[in-house]
């Protein structure tokens, strides 16, 4: 492991469309690939009328956009799908939406998927 | 060096089978989704169909579901496309293609292509 | 299924030029997004996956941008190799689908 670096091994999994799709809903995924390559999680989900509806989390392959962040955030101004990326077992677990945009102080709202 | 060899194209009447295979060789096959991707001659790329690495999961565009069947030997290093009711429109080049597992899956690797023409 | 349109279907350009290609969603699909060079009788090749990475090997010229609906493909500075159709792929569903194309042709 290079120093000052979280080695991503293994990320939450979640599958909104898994029964289409013929996969587990929830479980771990290990992350694997070239060893010259970084992995990370990430995470997508919509808001719905203030409900937040999980669609996907996994493995993410190697990404700048995600390299050095420990934490989950969607930083985009209300997007139709919240995405977010980050480095580290199982970083995904929570993730959160902090607007750059905004004007005002942002809320955080962390998510926890709920067991099937 | 990392390569994928289609084979099994041909000349086939409307109404016949075929079945494509795509040998893959240089990487661990068993580690990559596959995919067949084809294209209709001066046409565009058309997504066919994907398989997960254990072949698990098996996933369809409309225009060829309940007519194709992918699968996949990770015995042999091999990948399958069985087309059966072939029409006209599916006279195209089909390419094999290979994905990584994780998101968001792009296609990484492609063969050569394997022309597939369905003419009476 | 998601419809992937690209803009412009086809387009003139000199060695040297900037030029952009377009994709737009039918429907957000996140950075799930590809792009990919394809050359006469040649099978394509993978330029830029999730939306704005540099797939290995592909000249720093190339570039992507986007996320949900809206999406971007630049090369700064066109080269002769460069002489090619450029496709759009989502992946955010498991249904793929591809765009249109956009065709570069020499002015």
């Known amino acids: 492991a290079i120093l000052g670096r979280s080695e991503t091994q293994e990320c939450l999994f979640f599958n909104a469309n898994w029964e289409k799709d013929r996969t587990n809903q929830t479980g771990v995924e290990p992350c694997y690939g070239d060893k010259d390559k970084r992995r990370h999680c990430f995470a997508t989900w919509k808001n719905i009328s203030g409900s937040i509806e999980i669609v996907k989390q996994g493995c993410w392959l190697d990404d700048i956009n995600c390299y050095d962040r420990t934490d989950c955030v969607e930083k985009k101004d209300s997007p139709e799908v919240y995405f977010c990326c980050c480095e580290g077992n199982m970083c995904n677990e929570k993730f959160s939406y902090f607007p750059e945009m905004e004007v005002t102080q942002p809320t955080s709202n962390p998510v926890t998927p709920k067991p099937p | 060096e990392v390569q994928l060899l289609e084979s099994g194209g041909g000349l086939v009447q409307p109404g016949g089978s075929l079945r494509l295979s795509c040998a893959a060789s240089?990487?661990?096959?068993?580690?990559?989704?596959m995919g067949w991707v084809r294209q209709a001659p001066g046409k565009g790329l058309e997504w066919v169909s994907s398989?997960?690495?254990?072949?698990?999961?098996?996933y369809y565009a409309d225009s060829v579901k309940g007519r194709f069947t992918i699968s996949r030997d990770n015995s042999k290093n091999t990948l399958y496309l069985q087309m059966n009711s072939l029409r006209a429109e599916d006279t195209a080049v089909y390419y094999c293609?290979?994905?990584?597992?994780?998101?968001?899956?792009?296609?990484?690797?492609w063969g050569q292509g394997t022309l597939v023409t369905v003419s009476s | 299924d998601i419809q992937m349109t690209q803009s412009p279907s086809s387009l003139s350009a000199s060695v040297g030029d900037r030029v952009t290609i377009t994709c737009r969603a039918s429907?957000?699909?996140?950075?799930?997004l590809n792009w990919y060079q394809q050359k006469p009788g040649k099978a394509p090749k993978l330029l830029i996956y999730?939306?704005?990475n540099l797939q290995s090997g592909v000249p720093s010229r190339f570039s992507g941008s986007g996320s949900g609906t809206d999406f971007t493909l630049t090369i700064s500075s066109l080269q002769p190799e460069d002489f090619a159709t450029y496709y759009c792929?989502?992946?955010?569903?498991?249904?793929?689908?591809f765009g249109g194309g956009t065709k570069v042709e020499i002015k």
């Open positions: 999730a939306a704005s």
């Open positions: 792929q989502q992946s955010y569903s498991s249904l793929f689908t």
């Open positions: 293609a290979r994905s990584p597992a994780h998101s968001p899956h792009p296609f990484d690797i």
């Open positions: 240089g990487f661990a096959f068993s580690s990559y989704a």
């Open positions: 429907q957000s699909v996140s950075r799930f």
């Open positions: 398989i997960s690495t254990s072949g698990g999961s098996t």
